[in-house]
């Protein structure tokens, strides 16, 4: 049978043992910044070009013996995972290696920066097709390394990095914490987060998704036909770099934002056992395991959205947290969450010509998170309509009054410390979908968007008795753009989107008691784009034989177990 | 890349202008910041990435690096420019004593300075 990791990233339709991942990625160049590599290994021979770039520190210790196979071990294995003939993800991808890690696997931020600059200069001198840069390394948080990654990403390069093997918050490490980079955590054959000795995969809001990263068979530098099993978030990142190469080869015009959204969309959802993560990190960590898309077409019509969590605001009374979308994504809604329940809501506001989501802490609160729903909506024109707190007891309302604008999200923000002491508002009257309602003490913000063919509807799920979690999901073909709670009372901890489900969390039932205030409604706004669907159908009608499906069909190669497996 | 400054006179001129109180001051109201790795064993003191403001040209980067060398020399410190960045971020990599950080942060065009640190295979 094929190795478990290749089977895991293969879409269900192709899970039969005799199938292998497609021989794709041929239009893409993958840069690997790692150790030196054994370029004549049978797995990668002719696929990896070793550049003359080398920027490494001296090895530690006076008695260190430089042994070629040890020096090449990490990089060779990763090159094999990305594009290896037998055990690679993107068998058609060509690679270029830069040596930024020494024989002990150690490098410097400055060396990595100069390596990234080398890639940018190479790209300018000789522009090729899509570029993927794999950074299977991590150091402490570095402003300059993150900035360099941001610049390279804005130059159209896709950067994929390891989340880190420190069993810690990935936001404390670089380049894992750079928002423009696709940060990958590691899972095993049981879809458990990978444990590595006393440590393991990093987690948290800076991780974009997980991928296979334990017991990964790949090229060994011990000999030119040897194979070895290695584990780590580097291996996981190599899988995602391979998947990205496949996607970009099939659709070379994909932007970084589109690629990231597709990676998230085609991932296996909710398969990771979150109990492994620290309790406070579970809600922030994406429960996603990377997979190849079943085909390239059929994705174009989809309205893609993802959830972006802010950093924690901190506990001071006036503390705020800000969540931002990528430059070519639209902020379609904004929500907030506080573990203590003490928060003053959230609002969408303009910052540097772009909408951001800002959440507000309350007195006595331990801090808040802002949660942005970031979507790909071409030719969108979005604005925020605000209604100040209402005088009447009916609550505050705001709707999208511009012609052709639809409601994509509702936010509410209040100055009073505790809304719970006030009478909750009545629920929205039926038949008014383009309207946000909220507590009379709160100002309400409606996100209103106009985009070709965009249609949205509101879906609610109310529970009369208090419950820790209320959810409502959008049905097939619709995408969750907005997630909020009714009413905005103090026992509601907040609302956030998990994939296509709106989750509203409330305080522990035992602490709130079963009062009328216990009633909580989760409100989801579900949207779709008929325009994107039409465009996609036209595209499918005019093309043939260029999708991943076709490559899959053509590549029914058996996995041969005739190699030496050195463990 | 090849060094494009060449004019060593500038070093001496920079020294004289400072002594005459003519040295260019950093832009008003902007304070450059210093950053270092939170994980102490990973720090690499003695090597610093001086990041300049976004629109700084290569020639200005080289001039700023030379100015740092001149001002450091006046204080009896050696500085070694290991690389001048351009293409992604403007700035330079410098080997110098941490005693010079205060001086370096006051140079024109400087956005922030980061102490070098280690990265590791994962």
């Amino acid at each position: 049978s094929i190795p478990w990791n290749l089977e895991r990233i293969t879409p269900p339709r192709y899970r039969a043992d005799e199938y292998q991942p497609p021989d794709g990625g041929s239009l893409v160049e993958v840069y690997l910044l790692d150790t030196s590599i054994q370029s004549d290994h049978r797995e990668i021979e002719g696929r990896v070009m070793v550049t003359d770039f080398e920027n490494v520190p001296e090895e530690d210790g006076t008695r260190f013996h430089r042994q070629a196979s040890k020096c090449d071990s990490h990089g060779t294995h990763l090159a094999g995972v990305v594009s290896g003939r037998d055990a690679g993800v993107a068998k058609g991808a060509s690679m270029r290696s830069l040596r930024v890690l020494n024989c002990q696997g150690k490098g410097t931020v400055s060396g990595t920066l100069i390596g990234l600059e080398f890639i940018r200069k190479s790209q300018l001198v000789q522009p090729v097709g899509p570029l993927v840069v794999l950074l299977p390394l991590a150091g402490g948080y570095s402003r300059v390394l993150n900035a360099a990654c941001q610049r390279l990403a804005r130059a159209g390069v896709v950067l994929v990095t390891a989340a880190g093997n420190f069993r810690d918050d990935a936001c404390l490490y670089s380049p894992a914490s750079a928002p423009e980079v696709i940060t990958v955590g590691a899972t095993n054959a049981q879809d458990q987060p990978v444990t590595l000795g006393t440590l393991g995969t990093n987690f948290g809001r800076c991780v974009d998704l997980f991928a296979p990263g334990e017991d990964i068979i790949g090229a060994s530098s011990d000999c030119s036909t040897c194979f070895v099993s290695q584990s780590g978030t580097s291996q996981a990142a190599a899988h995602v770099a391979g998947i990205a190469a496949m996607m970009l080869s099939a659709e070379p015009e994909l932007t970084l934002a589109e690629l990231r959204q597709r990676l998230i969309h085609f991932s296996a959802k909710d398969v990771i056992n979150e109990a492994w993560f620290p309790e406070d990190q579970r809600v922030l960590t994406p429960n996603l395991v990377a997979a190849l898309p079943p085909s390239t077409h059929g994705a174009g019509w989809q309205l893609f959205c993802r959830t972006v969590w802010s950093a924690h605001s901190g506990p001071t009374r006036m503390a705020t947290a800000v969540a931002r979308c990528a430059p070519d994504e639209e902020l379609l809604s904004c929500s907030s969450f506080s573990r203590s329940g003490k928060r003053r809501g959230e609002r969408m506001e303009a910052q540097g010509g772009k909408l951001v989501c800002r959440a507000h802490n309350a007195f006595g609160g331990e801090g808040v998170y802002a949660i942005a729903r970031c979507c790909l909506l071409p030719q969108a024109n979005c604005s925020v309509h605000t209604a100040p707190p209402a005088e009447a007891s009916m609550g505050t309302r705001v709707h999208c009054h511009q012609q052709g604008h639809v409601l994509t999200g509702c936010s509410s923000h209040w100055e009073v410390e505790d809304l719970g002491t006030h009478k909750p508002p009545v629920l929205r009257p039926r038949g008014q979908p383009n309207q946000c309602v909220g507590h009379r003490e709160a100002s309400i913000h409606a996100s209103c968007c106009h985009a070709p063919g965009l249609e949205c509807k509101v879906k609610e799920h109310g529970i009369p008795a208090p419950q820790e979690q209320v959810t409502v999901a959008c049905e097939e073909g619709w995408t969750l753009t907005g997630c909020s709670a009714l009413p905005g009372t103090s026992h509601v901890l907040g609302a956030y989107a998990v994939d296509n489900t709106c989750v509203v969390r409330s305080r522990d039932v035992s602490t709130t008691g079963s009062t009328s205030e216990g009633a909580v409604t989760a409100v989801a706004i579900c949207c779709r784009s008929r325009h994107l669907a039409q465009a996609s159908q036209e595209l499918q009608g005019s093309t043939s034989g260029s999708g991943l499906n076709d490559i899959f069909e053509a590549q029914k190669i058996e996995w041969h177990e005739h190699h030496h497996h050195h463990h | 890349q090849e060094d494009e400054d060449g004019d060593y006179e500038e070093l001496v001129l920079a020294l004289r202008s400072e002594e005459d109180g003519l040295a260019e001051a950093p832009e008003h109201g902007t304070t450059a910041t210093f950053h270092r790795c939170a994980k102490d064993p990973w720090r690499l003191p003695g090597t610093y990435v001086v990041v300049l403001k976004e629109e700084t040209h290569l020639s200005q980067s080289e001039r700023t690096a030379r100015r740092l060398q001149a001002q450091a020399a006046r204080r009896g410190y050696l500085t070694k420019i290991l690389h001048v960045f351009h293409g992604l971020l403007p700035g330079f990599l410098v080997k110098m004593s941490g005693d010079l950080l205060e001086l370096a942060l006051k140079l024109p065009h400087v956005d922030y300075i980061e102490e070098d640190s280690s990265v590791f295979a994962q």
Epitope: E59, I114 | Y8, Y77, L78, L82
Partner: antibody, heavy 121, light 107 residues
Framework: QVQLVQSGAEVKKPGASVKVSCKAS????????IHWVRQAPGQGLEWMGE????????KFNQKFKDRVTMTRDTSISTAYMELSRLRSDDTAVYYC??????????????WGQGTTVTVSS | DIVMTQSPSSLSASVGDRVTITCKAS??????VAWYQQKPGKSPKLLIY???NRYTGVPSRFSGSGSGTDFTLTISSLQPEDFATYFC?????????FGGGTKVEIK
């Protein structure tokens, strides 16, 4: 042990170019700047320039700026110095030297054996 | 360029003699001065760095002093293997420059 081994002696005609190599061993080549220094017969030492092998950043003596090129090949841990438009007064022994940096001190701690370049018509 | 003027250009001494070589910089070079020894047909060898620090493996009879513009290399008791040419070098600013050399010969 740490050493720098240079290429053999060269005889060149005026106007020609010469390329001298300097192969490093016993240390991480990209971790140290390589300098080039020349010594005309019976004369003192003259610094020509330097290259940081890890970033290809170079610095030259103005005197040679238009005629000298310094490169390196990290795959074989070798630095190169090419001098063009040779004149008879370029006849000299050309040395490569490794620069060692210790906090606020630096110096040339390892030198190549030298390459004699003779320029004669 | 900073000019390093070395004196004397040559000297004759006997084994056991105390020998002093001086180097004067045309401008302040602080302590950024190194001293090298070169034997005929050989590469220079580092003796002293940062004006007064003896390099690893260099015998204690070699010492350096000075700062600013005036520097001295002293050999406290000349040994047979010390007959060679000595160069000072400044690395305070580019271009790095060397003194003209002092040839120490047997009297």
């Amino acid at each position: 042990q740490v050493q720098l081994v240079q290429s053999g002696a060269e005889v060149k005609k005026p106007g020609a170019s010469v390329k001298v190599s300097c192969k490093a061993s016993g240390y991480t080549f990209t971790g140290y700047t390589i300098h080039w220094v020349r010594q005309a017969p019976g004369q003192g030492l003259e610094w020509m320039g330097e290259i940081n092998p890890s970033s290809t950043y170079t610095k030259f003596n103005q005197k040679f700026k238009d005629r000298v090129t310094m490169t390196r090949d990290t795959s074989i841990s070798t630095a190169y110095m090419e001098l063009s438009r040779l004149r008879s007064d370029d006849t000299a022994v050309y040395y490569c030297a490794r620069e060692r940096i210790y906090s606020n001190y630096w110096f040339f701690d390892v030198w190549g054996q030298g390459t004699t370049v003779t320029v004669s018509s | 360029d900073i000019v390093m003027t070395q004196s004397p250009s040559s000297l004759s001494a006997s084994v056991g003699d105390r020998v002093t070589i001086t180097c004067k910089a045309s401008q302040n070079v602080y302590t950024a001065v190194a001293w090298y020894q070169q034997k005929p047909g050989k590469s220079p060898k580092l003796l002293i760095y940062s004006a007064s620090n003896r390099y690893t493996g260099v015998p204690s009879r070699f010492s350096g002093s000075g700062s600013g513009t005036d520097f001295t290399l002293t050999i406290s008791s000349l040994q047979p293997e010390d007959f060679a040419t000595y160069f000072c070098q400044q690395y305070s600013s580019y271009p790095y420059t060397f003194g003209g050399g002092t040839k120490v010969e047997i009297k």
